[in-house]
Amino acid sequence: EEELQVIQPDKSVSVAAGESAILHCTVTSLIPVGPIQWFRGAGPARELIYNQKEGHFPRVTTVSESTKRENMDFSISISNITPADAGTYYCVKFRKGSPDTEFKSGAGTELSVRAK
């Protein structure tokens, strides 16, 4: 049970176009030290969706809901969903360094978009 877990409880989420999508992620430890980032897709071509420290992400807000001692909430909400937003979203823990290195990823949440 080495170190932390990144938990994405929803395998899939379906949202009507124009609505907001909440993507849930909890992390069981801050150690190793380093940021949490959200991506759409996997591999080198993945798209950065949210990084708290830097960048401009006008459609993304953070929605921490958990008050449990045993984990911390790093969920996000994406507003005004369009069909172009469909895909699999990953919550990823990085280990702080120069540069930061990927430590562990959640299993992913597939976002599908319904017509209005």
């Epitope: 049970e1 080495e2 170190e3 932390l4 069981t28 430890s29 801050l30 150690i31 190793p32 030290v33 949490i36 708290q52 953070t62 929605v63 921490s64 008050t67 001692r69 045993e70 984990n71 911390m72 909430d73 790093f74 969920s75 996000i76």
Partner: antibody, heavy 118, light 111 residues
Framework: EVQLVESGGGLVKPGGSLRLSCAAS????????MSWVRQTPGKGLEWVAT????????YYPDSVKGRFTLSRDNAKNSLYLQMNSLRAEDTAVYYC???????????WGQGTTVTVSS | DIVITQSPASLAVSLGERATISCRAS??????????MHWYQQKPGQPPKLLIY???NLESGVPDRFSGSGSRTDFTLTINPLQAEDVATYYC?????????FGGGTKVEIK
Amino acid sequence: EVQLVESGGGLVKPGGSLRLSCAASGFTFSSYVMSWVRQTPGKGLEWVATISSGGTYTYYPDSVKGRFTLSRDNAKNSLYLQMNSLRAEDTAVYYCASQLTGSEFDYWGQGTTVTVSS
Amino acid sequence: DIVITQSPASLAVSLGERATISCRASESVDSYGNSFMHWYQQKPGQPPKLLIYRASNLESGVPDRFSGSGSRTDFTLTINPLQAEDVATYYCHQSADLPWTFGGGTKVEIK
């Protein structure tokens, strides 16, 4: 009942070494991040060292980096702080503390006193 | 380093009245809506005890006369109503970024 019992404190001369131990019981030690925090009348509470649940990652403030080494033995539910090149300013009560999430300090031991003086 | 300024250094409050302690961080301790500021109580000769975690969450077993609030850089611990057993020193602590740091403490006494 959670218990953290520190030992190994004492009087040591500047430049000397001490090894502090912390024996844990009453919780799943191997699942917890563990830390040492010290307290002095002058400087209040000061974080000293942290180790990840599996022992892979350790963190120290600049004030002790290179002089203190933190380790753990999950099979023995024990935490160890090796303190070398001790200085007068290291004089303090040293507390062992657990952190389920590597965030807040949930449980604290009663502390062990380290005095560095010639 | 994140510097935490805690005030006041000491506080005398009548039994049954409200005690309010403040901590201000030199930079935000928030991440994804989590505020990584925590509060501890320390009585003489004892180790610190966790009261409030992540700004506003009451630790299990802690009386609900203790409450925490705040976000980003400004945080408050409130004890209402103050009881005799609450005489202690209270500390805030940030775990948003290394090195983790503590406030200087507030000694609460009965007026």
